[in-house]
C-alpha cells in the first residue's frame, strides 16, 4: 500500500530535497528556509533566493521549512511540576523536564507530570528511578507492595491481592483471634 500523501507533501516531492514547489507556479522550485527562520516571500523565479526572515523572540523553527510563521515556544507546565531544562531559541523549542529525584508520568503523548521517586522504605531498590519510570521496590518480609510503596501486612485485608504475600501474617492474626475465643 502506498501511504497517502497530503497536498503539501505531494508538491514538495516534485522538487529536489531542500526545495519546495512555488505555490503559484509549479514549474519553480524554491529553496527552503533554514531552521531558525521562516518564509517571508517565495522566490521570484528559478535560481533566485527565497526571502527568509529570522524568527522573533518567543518563536522558533527546528528544521528547514517553508512555514509562513514560526512556531510558538512551549511553556513548561508549573502545575505539573515541570521545570525548564533549556530555554527556547530561534531554532529549538523549550526543553522541559523534572527536578532531581523525580520521574515523568505521561498523561498523553506530549503531556507529563513530575512525581517524586519512591524511596523504598521497608524494602530495597530493585530498579533505580529513571527519567520515565519510578523506582521498582522489593518489600521486606511482613510488607507488601501497594502503589509502589511497602505497606505493613497488618493493613492487608483478605479480599486484596496482598493475601498471598502476607499469608503467614494473616494466618497468625487469625490464629490469635481464634485462640482468644472461648
Amino acid at each position: 500500500l502506498v501511504p497517502h500523501l497530503g497536498d503539501r507533501e505531494k508538491r514538495d516531492s516534485v522538487c529536489p530535497q531542500g526545495k519546495y514547489i512555488h505555490p503559484q507556479n509549479n514549474s519553480i522550485c524554491c529553496t527552503k528556509c533554514h531552521k531558525g527562520t521562516y518564509l517571508y516571500n517565495d522566490c521570484p523565479g528559478p535560481g533566485q533566493d527565497t526571502d527568509c526572515r529570522e524568527c522573533e523572540s518567543g518563536s522558533f523553527t527546528a528544521s528547514e521549512n517553508h512555514l509562513r510563521h514560526c512556531l510558538s515556544c512551549s511553556k513548561c507546565r508549573k502545575e505539573m511540576g515541570q521545570v525548564e531544562i533549556s530555554s527556547c531559541t530561534v531554532d529549538r523549542d523549550t526543553v522541559c523536564g523534572c527536578r532531581k529525584n523525580q520521574y515523568r508520568h505521561y498523561w498523553s503523548e506530549n503531556l507529563f507530570q513530575c512525581f517524586n521517586c519512591s524511596l523504598c522504605l521497608n524494602g530495597t531498590v530493585h530498579l533505580s528511578c529513571q527519567e520515565k519510570q519510578n523506582t521498582v521496590c522489593t518489600c521486606h518480609a511482613g510488607f507488601f507492595l501497594r502503589e509502589n510503596e511497602c505497606v505493613s501486612c497488618s493493613n492487608c485485608k483478605k479480599s486484596l491481592e496482598c493475601t498471598k504475600l502476607c499469608l503467614p501474617q494473616i494466618e497468625n492474626v487469625k490464629g490469635t483471634e481464634d485462640s482468644g475465643t472461648t
Partner: nanobody, 124 residues
C-alpha cells in the same frame, strides 16, 4: 461505541459535598487513563483531575487540591470524583473524559472522548 455517562450532580450549599460517578462502556476501561474536566458558565474548559490506570498517579488542579479526590473501580468500569468543601466557584458542568495518546490532539485538551456532563451548582 465508547460511552461515558456522568451522574451525581445537583444543587448543594457552600461547604457541602457531592460524589460524581462516570459509567464507562465500549472500551477496556482499565487500559486507559481517565480524567474530569469542567466548564463554568461563560468560561472555558478547565482540567480538574486525572487518574492513571490503577490509581498510582493522580493530578489535581490547584483550585481543587485537598478538597477533591479522584478514584476508579476497574471491576465496575466506573470513575469517581469526591468533592468536599464545595465553593460557589466550583459551579460548572463536570465532564468525565478519556485521555488519549493521539499526537494530533492539542496538549491543552488531550482527550478523545467525553460524556454529556453533569451540572454541579453550589449556592446558598
Amino acid at each position: 461505541e465508547v460511552q461515558l455517562l456522568e451522574s451525581g450532580g445537583g444543587l448543594v450549599q457552600p461547604g457541602g459535598s457531592l460524589r460524581l460517578s462516570c459509567a464507562a462502556s465500549g472500551f477496556t476501561f482499565g487500559g486507559y487513563q481517565m480524567g474530569w474536566v469542567r466548564q463554568a458558565p461563560g468560561k472555558g474548559l478547565e482540567w480538574v483531575s486525572f487518574i492513571d490506570f490503577t490509581g498510582a498517579h493522580t493530578y489535581y488542579a490547584d483550585s481543587v487540591k485537598g478538597r477533591f479526590t479522584i478514584s476508579r473501580d476497574n471491576s465496575k468500569n466506573t470513575l469517581y470524583l469526591q468533592m468536599n468543601s464545595l465553593r460557589a466557584e466550583d459551579t460548572a458542568v463536570y465532564y468525565c473524559a478519556k485521555l488519549s495518546d493521539d499526537l494530533t490532539l492539542p496538549e491543552r485538551f488531550p482527550f478523545d472522548y467525553w460524556g454529556q456532563g453533569t451540572l454541579v451548582t453550589v449556592s446558598s
